[in-house]
């Protein structure tokens, strides 16, 4: 038969012959011949090859360097590389995760929109009107301003994106009271405490 010009998947062309590639986890020792198949050898400890290949050397597993904040997320096999991730509180600087940096904190006036993971940094967002953050944190979201009304209090100091509102009791001088009919000769009238005081002393 005519020598092939192309081979099937998982084969390679050499010396006008299609030879089988080595399977993942194995490296090439010798090419096939008319009478023998491709000879392959398993990768050694701490080595891998993750594809059908004709490599004569296996790749070394990645080293997760603790000095760079890295730790092993998944141990490598003869067919897969080691997967590194970052220690708690740190995240990878790249997709390859070759080193780690500390998670960013969101400054006062900003809250955490998305908590950092081993591979992504903290995402901050400015606190919108009605919300605040008074701390620098990698976990805290923007908190809503306190609702003074629900506590029967009034706003004494407006909130900002960095501070909560300050609530206080209602002003005694401006507090409205309803005078009963007996006190005002049957006439119902809204008067202030000041007026009431004046009325009683006359």
């Amino acid at each position: 038969p005519e020598p092939p010009t192309a081979c099937r998947e998982k084969q390679y062309l050499i010396n006008s012959q299609c030879c089988s590639l080595c399977q993942p986890g194995q490296k090439l020792v010798s090419d096939c011949t008319e009478f023998t198949e491709t000879e392959c050898l398993p990768c050694g400890e701490s080595e891998f090859l993750d594809t059908w290949n004709r490599e004569t050397h296996c790749h070394q597993h990645k080293y997760c360097d603790p000095n760079l904040g890295l730790r092993v997320q998944q141990k490598g096999t003869s067919e897969t590389d080691t997967i590194c991730t970052c220690e708690e509180g740190w995240h990878c600087t790249s997709e390859a995760c070759e080193s780690c940096v500390l998670h960013r904190s969101c400054s006062p006036g900003f809250g955490v929109k998305q908590i950092a993971t081993g591979v992504s940094d903290t995402i901050c967002e400015p606190c919108p009107v009605g919300f605040f953050s008074n701390v620098s944190s990698a976990f805290e979201k923007c908190h809503p301003w306190t609702s003074c009304e629900t506590k029967d209090l009034v706003v004494q100091q407006a909130g900002t994106n960095k501070t909560d509102v300050v609530c206080g009791p209602q002003d005694r001088l401006r507090e409205q009271k309803l005078i009963s009919e007996e006190d005002l000769g049957g006439e119902q009238k809204l008067i202030s405490e000041e007026d009431l005081h004046h009325h009683h002393h006359h």
Epitope: R8, E9, K10, Q11, C19, S20, L21, Q23, C32, T36, E37, T38, E39, C40
Partner: antibody, heavy 122, light 108 residues
């Protein structure tokens, strides 16, 4: 005339082991890759494993990887399948099949044995 | 892994009919497609290899065609002994070796 004759099938409990054999004749055994293919009752064909002709390189279907071991003895013209940690879903007729090539990227299968039934049940 | 899909899954026909079974690969497999016939209680038998080459001893009423992803097995004039289950198999990207789910050909 090419002949493939399987043996070793039978009833085995889940978690048990069984070793199948396939005696080959009528061709140069070491020149061809050999396969095991199985067929569950009333189902289609499922390829299980392959072993190359001279060196004895092996490859397995994901469903049996780590549990089954294919081997061959070229001096005895015999193919084997050692089956460990058997499960109910391994119940099937197991066929040995001769490849048309020497290496593990072979097929089609030009000759098949008559099959041996493996039943995994308690 | 390459998936092989056969259609129809079952088919009723009469002696003398022309029958076509199709097989589709999930990616191009060039012409590396084989067809097998299996009768109840028997081992499969190779009919056609390399999409269109007839295996030695197989009657000429069987033929195969196609390349890339779409293939057909044709029986030009059904004979009583042709009622069986037919399987396609790719041999382009192996191992793993993958078969179609089978087409059962029954007497009408």
């Amino acid at each position: 005339e090419v002949q493939l004759v399987e043996s070793g099938g039978g009833l085995v409990q889940p978690g048990g082991s069984l070793r199948l054999s396939c005696a080959a004749s009528g061709f140069t055994f070491s020149s061809y890759a050999m396969n095991w293919v199985r067929q569950a009752p009333g189902k289609g064909l499922e390829w299980v494993s392959i072993i190359s002709g001279t060196i004895g390189k092996t490859y397995y279907a994901d469903s049996v990887k780590g549990r089954f071991t294919i081997s061959r003895d070229n001096s005895k013209n015999t193919l084997y399948l050692q089956m460990n940690s058997l499960r109910g879903e391994d119940t099937a007729v197991y066929y040995c099949a001769k490849d048309t090539e020497r290496d593990i990227t072979g097929s089609p299968f030009d000759y098949w044995g008559q099959g041996t039934l493996v039943t995994v049940s308690s | 892994d390459i998936q092989m899909t056969q259609s129809p899954s079952s088919l009723s026909a009469s002696v003398g009919d022309r029958v076509t079974i199709t097989c589709r690969a999930s990616q191009s497999i060039s012409s590396y497609l084989n067809w097998y016939q299996q009768k109840p209680g028997k081992a499969p038998k190779l009919l056609i290899y390399a999409a269109s080459s007839l295996q030695s001893g197989v009657p000429s009423r069987f033929s195969g065609s196609g390349s890339g992803t779409d293939f057909t097995l044709t029986i030009s004039s059904l004979q009583p002994e042709d009622f069986a289950t037919y399987y396609c198999q790719q041999s382009y990207s192996t191992p793993p070796i993958t078969f179609g789910q089978g087409t059962r050909l029954e007497i009408k």
